[in-house]
């Protein structure tokens, strides 16, 4: 028996369902009574789900997994993982045994989009050209860790005087806070981009300083 899985990682959004695809080619006359199917975590060998002795043995993994019982006889051994969590990320191995056995591993990459950044300025009043200001760009509840970029109003990257911190919450999602310190000109626009490297999802925030009052322009 030959087991086939997708070579590319399966990308799943947090709180959605994911399908880890696995298939085999059944011989003519194959019946489910001959099938032993085991899904397990590749690294720890922890059992996730199994089908043995002609029946589904159920989920051994937080009761969030399921097979596709009607499709098993056609060689579809895929696993459905419900309400994906950050902690589900990793490699899963699909073992299929009929007369002989084969196995293959599939990777699950978990992702969550970052929120539109909120921009804050300190100090935020009585600003004058030559003043040093701190612009903070905050974006929340994303996964994995973000890439953060700053650009000035002409699209040139700002790399000096940038400090970025990322903290995971209890669900493993990251809150990003990036701080840019700049000396003000007569006016200026400063933009922050928070990029999710897995989803290639960009979230932009901008602040334009034109004396008083400050403006926070809409996204372009």
């Amino acid at each position: 028996v030959e087991v086939q899985v997708s070579e590319d990682p399966v990308v799943a959004l947090v709180d959605t369902d994911a399908t880890l695809r696995c298939s085999f080619s059944p011989e003519p006359g194959f019946s489910l009574a001959q099938l032993n199917l085991i899904w397990q975590l590749t690294d720890t060998k922890q059992l996730v789900h199994s089908f043995t002795e002609g029946r589904d043995q159920g989920s051994a993994y937080s009761n969030r997994t399921a097979l596709f019982p009607d499709l098993l006889v056609q060689g579809n051994a895929s696993l459905r993982l419900q309400r994906v969590r950050v902690t589900d990320e990793g490699s899963y191995t699909c073992f299929v045994s009929i007369q002989d056995f084969d196995s293959a591993a599939v990777s699950l990459q978990v992702a969550a989009p970052y929120s539109k950044p909120s921009m804050t300025l300190e100090p935020n009043k009585d600003l004058r050209p030559g003043n040093m200001v701190t612009i903070t760009c905050s974006s929340y509840q994303g996964y994995p860790e973000a890439e953060v970029f700053w650009k000035d109003g002409q699209g040139v990257p700002l790399t000096g005087n940038v400090t970025t911190s990322q903290m995971a919450n209890e669900r493993g999602l990251f809150d990003v806070h990036s701080v840019l310190r700049v000396v003000l000109g007569a006016n200026g626009t400063y933009s922050c981009l928070v990029r999710n490297p897995v989803l290639q999802q960009d979230a932009h925030g901008s602040v334009t300083i034109t004396g008083q009052p400050l403006t926070f322009p809409p996204e372009a």
Epitope: D152, Q154, V156, G185, Q200, D202
Partner: antibody, heavy 121, light 112 residues
């Protein structure tokens, strides 16, 4: 008419430096960044870096960092790029180009005619 | 770094014919928020500087004839010239601006 006028061809010796100029006209010079691009037979078009004419902020391609220096003179609407410690591999045409766009997507809508730099002993 | 690969490196067609050239990027250039691809096409005629033809993968720069069409998304892009004219003799470059800027190696268009 929007134009970027570049300085003339340069013949320099290995190890020396060259400074190329790019003068903007027909638009408000400090409203747009100036990018520099190298064109050689070996490497096609290569982005060197960018300078924001209003913010005086520069960003260099890692390959050219430490050897290229971009500056602007706002009073004359001119951008400059100096390239130091030249070798034969720096023989190329160097273009300045105006950065145009919005948000985080920028493209080069106006180009200078190019400055040919030849490095030879 | 994002690598841009253009093909073919050169091609020759007769005036009036349709031509297509390809540009592939090593990672997606699609901004999922704006649904725009950060890809531009430039035309460089012999002895001249490059000229912007297309940006956002498919938006024609003002003044560019409508026989030039950009298409594609993600990692695969195409520039099509529906009815090639003698003045289209040039090298065509694609360029990504998703992460800094990199150009493809160019496609040289020759007229038979």
């Amino acid at each position: 008419e929007v134009q970027l006028q570049q300085s003339g061809p340069e013949l320099v010796r290995p190890g020396e430096s060259v400074k190329i100029s790019c003068k903007g006209s027909g638009y408000t010079f400090t409203d747009y960044a100036i990018h520099w691009v190298k064109q050689s037979h070996a490497k096609s078009l290569e982005w060197i870096g960018v300078i924001s004419t209003y913010y005086d902020n520069t960003y260099y391609n890692q390959k050219f960092k430490g050897r290229a220096t971009m500056t602007v003179d706002k009073s004359s609407s001119t951008a400059y790029m100096e390239l130091a410690r030249l070798t034969s591999e720096d023989s190329a045409i160097y273009y300045c180009a105006r950065g145009y766009g919005s948000s985080f997507n920028w493209y080069f809508d106006v180009w200078g005619a190019g400055t040919t730099v030849t490095v030879s002993s | 770094d994002i690598v841009m690969t253009q093909s073919p490196s050169s091609l020759a067609v007769s005036a009036g014919e349709k031509v297509t050239m390809s540009c592939k990027s090593s990672q997606s250039l699609l901004n999922s928020r704006t649904r725009k691809n950060y890809l531009a096409w430039y035309q460089q005629k012999p002895g001249q500087s490059p000229k912007l033809l297309i940006y956002w993968a498919s938006t024609r720069e003002s003044g560019v004839p409508d026989r030039f069409t950009g298409s594609g998304s993600g990692t695969d892009f195409t520039l099509t010239i529906t009815s090639v004219q003698a003045e289209d003799l040039a090298v065509y470059y694609c360029k990504q601006s998703y992460n800094l800027y990199t150009f493809g190696g160019g496609t040289k268009l020759e007229i038979k």
